[in-house]
């Protein structure tokens, strides 16, 4: 048994519609059947939870209905999408993976993905 490693891209640029996607991959040291994935945002020294989902291995990832996150899972890889981002949301987004069941519990925290969000320029008014 050993600690769990989590890998995620260093940088991602959100689309003009404020959508950012990245892959979070973990090297599972145990045979987990229940996994929890959490996206954290780190700004200065403050860490806040953006969204979280628990899934059974082999099943789909389900975030709450009002979550700004969606995702799919495939083996030890989770494809995460964060929506509704604005320029002020630019920051470091950390992927946290927890192997919840069966015991022992394992924690894995990625180094974070810096997501850059650029608000689209407003369309110029037409003069006719």
């Amino acid at each position: 048994c050993k600690a769990m490693h989590v890998a995620q891209p260093a940088v991602v640029l959100a689309s003009s519609r404020g959508i950012a996607s990245f892959v979070c991959e973990y090297a599972s040291p145990g045979k987990a059947t229940e996994v929890r994935v959490t996206v954290l945002r780190q700004a200065d020294s403050q860490v806040t939870e953006v969204c979280a989902a628990t899934y059974m291995m082999g099943n789909e990832l389900t975030f709450l209905d009002d979550s700004i996150c969606t995702g799919t899972s495939s083996g030890n890889q989770v494809n995460l999408t964060i929506q509704g981002l604005r320029a002020m949301d630019t920051g470091l987004y950390i992927c946290k993976v927890e192997l919840m069941y069966p015991p022992p519990y394992y924690l894995g925290i990625g180094n974070g993905t810096q997501i850059y969000v650029i608000d689209p320029e407003p369309c110029p008014d037409s003069d006719f």
Partner: antibody, heavy 118, light 107 residues
Framework: QVQLVESGGGVVEPGRSLRLSCAAS????????MHWVRQAPGKGLEWVAV????????DYADSAKGRFTISRDNSKNTLYLQMNSLRAEDTAVYYC???????????WGQGTLVTVSS | EIVLTQSPGTLSLSPGERATLSCRAS??????LAWYQQKPGQAPRPLIY???SRATGIPDRFSGSGSGTDFTLTISRLEPEDFAVYYC?????????FGPGTKVDIK
């Protein structure tokens, strides 16, 4: 601000039971894992048990398995530790602690003393 | 379970001196290592998490370093309020384990 307040400690005879409580405030209780950690007089820290986000997700130290039960009531923002078949070696200050978003134990209660003695 | 060993057991130093505390794990804990400070009659207080990140409100005279199985807590210049017991802890897997502690006392 985050606050954790333990209660329920006291003097109990060997073989008897005791239930500890930890009242939490200042944060969204249901979003955090919660731990019990104990410290025997003059000794170091010993992790006892954890309960995660769902009430079914629990884990115990070997010394607690089969005798102690951790539980939580998210509607009351309260963590519990039911301790059965108590032994003299369970004498300790029992702390509840929050599992922070980054995993380490970021907030601790002031502790409650449990003395098992005949 | 991961066993943590701390050395020395006791460190006798004077205010203003540098304190170096060691923590060794029986197997790799990667970066899931924290340090806590405890004073008599008080609950532990987190100092360092993730090997080297300072917890909220912790002065920069406290620093952590290391990787894998060998870790160090350094207090650059001891202040009177720093004399206490220090515990390392791994939180990457259960059972969560603490080291036996290092007592830093006044010489």
């Amino acid at each position: 601000q985050v606050q954790l307040v333990e209660s329920g400690g006291g003097v109990v005879e060997p073989g008897r039971s005791l239930r500890l409580s930890c009242a939490a405030s200042g944060f969204t209780f249901s979003s955090y894992g919660m731990h019990w950690v104990r410290q025997a007089p003059g000794k170091g820290l010993e992790w006892v048990a954890v309960i995660w986000y769902k009430t079914s997700e629990k884990d115990y130290a070997d010394s607690a398995k089969g005798r102690f039960t951790i539980s939580r009531d998210n509607s009351k923002n309260t963590l519990y530790l039911q301790m059965n078949s108590l032994r003299a070696e369970d004498t300790a200050v029992y702390y509840c602690a929050r599992a922070g978003l980054l995993g380490y134990f970021d907030y601790w209660g002031q502790g409650t003393l449990v003395t098992v003695s005949s | 379970e991961i066993v943590l060993t701390q050395s020395p057991g006791t460190l006798s130093l004077s205010p203003g001196e540098r304190a170096t505390l060691s923590c060794r794990a029986s197997q790799s804990v990667t970066s899931y290592l924290a340090w806590y400070q405890q004073k008599p009659g008080q609950a532990p207080r987190p100092l360092i998490y993730g090997v080297s990140s300072r917890a909220t409100g912790i002065p920069d005279r406290f620093s952590g370093s290391g990787s894998g199985t060998d870790f160090t807590l350094t207090i650059s210049r001891l202040e009177p309020e720093d004399f206490a017991v220090y515990y390392c802890q791994q939180y990457g897997m259960s059972p969560f384990t603490f080291g036996p502690g290092t007592k830093v006392d006044i010489k």
